[in-house]
């Protein structure tokens, strides 16, 4: 239970006092305040908001609040030379042009500095050519095109629908296929839920709405010009040709009205199957090129965006711990938005603001947490997780020695159906115990716990009576803390019903229509889901910062390690002959997992029994728990991805948003049947099994008795 050291509030009321202080009305008020104008990274408006948050966090009672600035590579459209795509006739005349901006939402017609839709970090260019429709531009979509349909994308402009995977992976795949340009569009099949009106009458995407977003493939590098090191005043910057992760071909996003005009003329091959058809009234022909009557027409892209080194600002607030000030629990979320940020990020930032206010209220009453809590308002998340990554690079030595946990706080909602949690297995028990103590906000679950409604609506696929908790992937600010530094991390938000809503993300994601009104009218009028998310995020931070013994259960890691080992073994066993030929064995991995399980079990027994009044022993046991996540870090990183260093989890090489388990082995096995040198390929599988087995065994030994 929570500590009562250095406090005048009795232990059982500590958490309750904190949770009771959180108010839905305040979150609503903060959300309104944060969403009236755009807060694009690198702009004066976002700098002003940083200073406002700094000032308010000081007022709330934090011990110190500082701005941490960095000069990083950002990307903006050219204000006088707009980006667009044309259909051109045989004479080169533009007979159709895509829109230059989204129709502004009601009440926002006179707002200035709304950045038009663009793909951040697209190079400049004006390629023209035939169009090829590539579905979601996933790895498997290009396999289908190239291997089964024998369609060559080389020299073509590809058009891909948003959804399923991170847009940067789509662009990477298109580049590898030889495309000379990429058009990204939102298909109603993915961004228009049946039976719901489009904004402003509902939460669906209108035909003129467009999803912005970066198209980098940074693999955890942070600022493309200063990988591994902070982009500070004396930074050495790479030349643009050596920058990390920049796309090499022009890319531009459009809405479905414009997509209709491009896709309706498509000829060539029919779609291979129904999974390639969206909801537009077009044939979804793959191409290449337009059909008979229009075969002389081409598509031309006009992209004039520029990459610029620009100053960004994180806000870092500190609430010093009373007992272990050198142990840090971090709550962080970003502040920068593409436009108004009604959901992303300000529904999260408003929750962080209220959590800070509540902690500040307790502090003013004489309470302090056991451990130090750091609060962060990150900048330039939308441009590649830049603010968080640069700060972590600057403070990496402190973080790797002192970092207990990181809780992410981007969008609080992506729906209003049930809770969604992604976290390290170390936090499973914390999340379970906390949600059992919180009230469910869901209709039909009055008087029931959050755990109960969550478990009912989102059951675990493996364990009956338990809720689903997912692996951490990436695409958000926890990345550097978890994947690079090995700090136990978690995230929570309210989500949609994935079974009935098959669209990707939420329909208005990264569009101009992500406004305060979207949230207040359609998603959470009472802000009860926001309050619940505040209780979950804040409650996790409270327990992590205040429990005498860290609320980590290493036995849950043992369970998932066995599950992941079984899964990767079964993938490998799809090639039984090759495994025999090349003497591929998983014995070392299963043995390491078995050892981990036994040692974790014994550690947990000792954890129950040790003398918690002995501060040295307490600190020793807590350090073993804190450093367990760190023990899964391989200092050499994953192949070709040096900043993804966690051996158990990494963002999928095919979808940055998704987490992959035993990623080194998984990637070595992926498409292995197509490798030109099978002996070398299976040798790499064996090496990755060795690395994984060693890492699991080494991690296990950190839990053994110290002497």
């Amino acid at each position: 239970k929570s500590s009562n050291e250095a406090t005048n509030i009795t232990p059982k009321h500590n958490m309750k006092a904190f949770l009771d202080e959180l108010k839905a009305e305040n979150i609503k008020k903060f959300l309104y305040n944060f969403t009236q104008i755009p807060h694009l990274a690198g702009t004066e408006q976002n700098f002003q908001l940083a200073k406002q948050i700094q000032s308010q966090w000081k007022e709330f009672g934090l011990d110190s609040v500082e701005l941490a600035h960095y000069d990083v590579l950002l990307s903006y459209p050219n204000k006088t030379h707009p980006n667009y795509i044309s259909i051109i006739n045989e004479d080169g005349n533009e007979i159709f042009n895509t829109s230059l901006f989204e129709p502004p939402p009601p009440g926002y017609e006179n707002v200035s500095d709304i950045v038009p839709p663009f793909s951040a970090f697209s190079p400049q260019g004006m390629p023209e050519g035939d169009l090829v429709y590539v579905n979601y531009a996933r790895t498997e979509d290009f396999f289908k095109l190239e291997r089964d349909m024998k369609i060559n994308c080389s020299g073509k402009i590809v058009i891909a629908r948003y959804g399923k995977v991170f847009r940067g992976n789509k662009v990477k795949n298109a580049q590898l296929a030889g495309a000379k340009g990429v058009i990204l569009y939102s298909d109603p099949a993915d961004y228009f839920a049946p039976g719901v009106k489009s904004y402003p009458d509902g939460w669906n995407l209108p035909g003129g709405g467009v999803q912005r977003g970066n198209i980098l493939n940074l693999n955890g590098a942070g600022d493309p010009l200063t990988p591994g090191y902070p982009a500070n005043e004396y930074a050495y910057r790479r030349g643009i040709a050596e920058a990390v992760g920049l796309p090499s071909i022009p890319v531009h996003p459009i809405g479905y009205y414009d997509a209709q005009k491009l896709l309706e003329k498509m000829g060539g091959s029919a779609p291979p199957d129904s999974s390639w058809r969206g909801s537009l009234k077009v044939p979804y022909n793959v191409g290449p090129g337009f059909t008979g009557n229009f075969s002389t027409q081409k598509v031309k892209m006009h992209i004039h965006s520029t990459n610029e080194v620009t100053r960004i600002y994180n806000v870092i607030g500190t609430l010093r711990g009373a007992v272990e000030p050198d142990r840090y629990v971090i709550l962080g979320g970003h502040r920068d938005s593409w436009v108004f940020g009604g959901i992303d990020p300000q529904s999260g930032a408003a929750v962080v603001h209220e959590i800070v206010r509540s902690f500040g209220t307790l502090k003013k009453e004489g309470w302090r947490p056991r451990r130090t809590i750091l609060f962060a308002s990150w900048d330039a998340e939308e441009f590649g997780l830049l603010g968080s990554t640069e700060w972590a690079e600057e403070n990496s030595r402190l973080l790797q020695e002192r970092g207990v946990a990181y809780i992410n706080a981007d969008s609080s909602i992506e729906g209003n159906y049930t809770l969604r949690v992604d976290c390290t297995p170390l936090m499973y028990s914390l999340v379970h115990n906390l949600t059992k103590e919180l009230k469910s906000p869901d209709e039909g679950f009055e008087g029931k716990s959050l755990y109960e409604s969550w478990t009912k609506k989102s059951p675990s696929p493996e364990f009956s009576g338990m809720p689903r908790i997912s692996k951490l992937g990436s695409g958000n600010d926890f990345e550097v803390f978890f994947q690079r530094l090995g700090i136990a991390s978690g995230r929570a938000r309210y989500t949609k019903n994935w079974e009935t809503n098959k669209f990707s993300g939420y329909p208005l994601y990264h569009s101009v229509y992500e406004t305060y009104e979207l949230v207040e009218k359609f998603y959470d009028p009472m802000f009860k889901y926001h309050l619940t998310v505040a209780q979950v995020r804040g409650g996790m931070v409270f327990e992590l910062a205040n429990s005498i013994v860290l609320p980590f259960d290493c036995r849950d890691y043992a369970v998932v390690l066995r599950k992941y080992a079984d899964k990767i073994y079964s993938i490998s066993m799809k090639h039984p002959q090759e495994m025999k030929t090349y003497s591929v064995s998983f014995d070392s991995l299963f043995s390491a997992v078995k050892n981990f399980t036994e040692i974790a079990s014994k550690f947990s027994e000792r954890l129950q029994d040790f003398d918690k009044s002995n501060p040295i022993v307490l600190r020793m046991m807590n350090d073993q728990l804190m450093f367990l996540e760190r023990a899964f870090i391989d200092p050499l990183g994953l192949p070709d991805r040096p900043f993804y260093r966690h051996v158990i989890y990494a963002p999928s090489s095919h979808n940055k948003y998704a987490g992959e388990s035993f990623p080194g082995i998984y990637d070595a096995l992926f498409d292995i049947e197509s490798k030109v040198d099978p002996s070398k390929a299976w040798g790499e599988v064996k090496r990755q099994i060795y690395v994984a087995a060693f890492t699991v065994q080494a991690a296990a030994e950190t839990l053994s008795e110290v002497a």
């Epitope: 667009y84 159709f96 042009n97 895509t98 829109s99 230059l100 901006f101 989204e102 129709p103 502004p104 009601p106 017609e109 209108p206 035909g207 003129g208 709405g209 809405g255 009205y257 414009d258 209709q260 005009k261």
Partner: nanobody
Framework: EVQLVESGGGVVRPGGSLRLSCAAS????????MNWVRQAPGKGLDWVAF????????YYADSVKGRFTISRDNSKNTLHLQMNSLRPEDTAVYYC????????????????WGQGTMVTVSS
Amino acid sequence: EVQLVESGGGVVRPGGSLRLSCAASGFPLISYGMNWVRQAPGKGLDWVAFITYDGSNRYYADSVKGRFTISRDNSKNTLHLQMNSLRPEDTAVYYCAKDRIVGARVPDAYDIWGQGTMVTVSS
């Protein structure tokens, strides 16, 4: 009150020019495609020109292509029609009409009309 008010009509000799304007009030012009439509004496309505909400696309009836130019100033909530090389058959009442669908990329149905301005081309 939602309304469109046309102006700029008049009498002009063949080969002459006129510039029609249409002022919108009560709704944001910036979100909608806009049309010019005309009705010659004793005839039905004829669509003349369309401009998308953002000005990225302009479409014209074959009879006016190369002579008429549709434009807009969203900051002033106004629509224009520059008419050059006017012919007697261009004589008509000219109406501006708002497109029904926010963000439409091609002309759709109209839902708000002006009262019209008379253009007479005569020697």
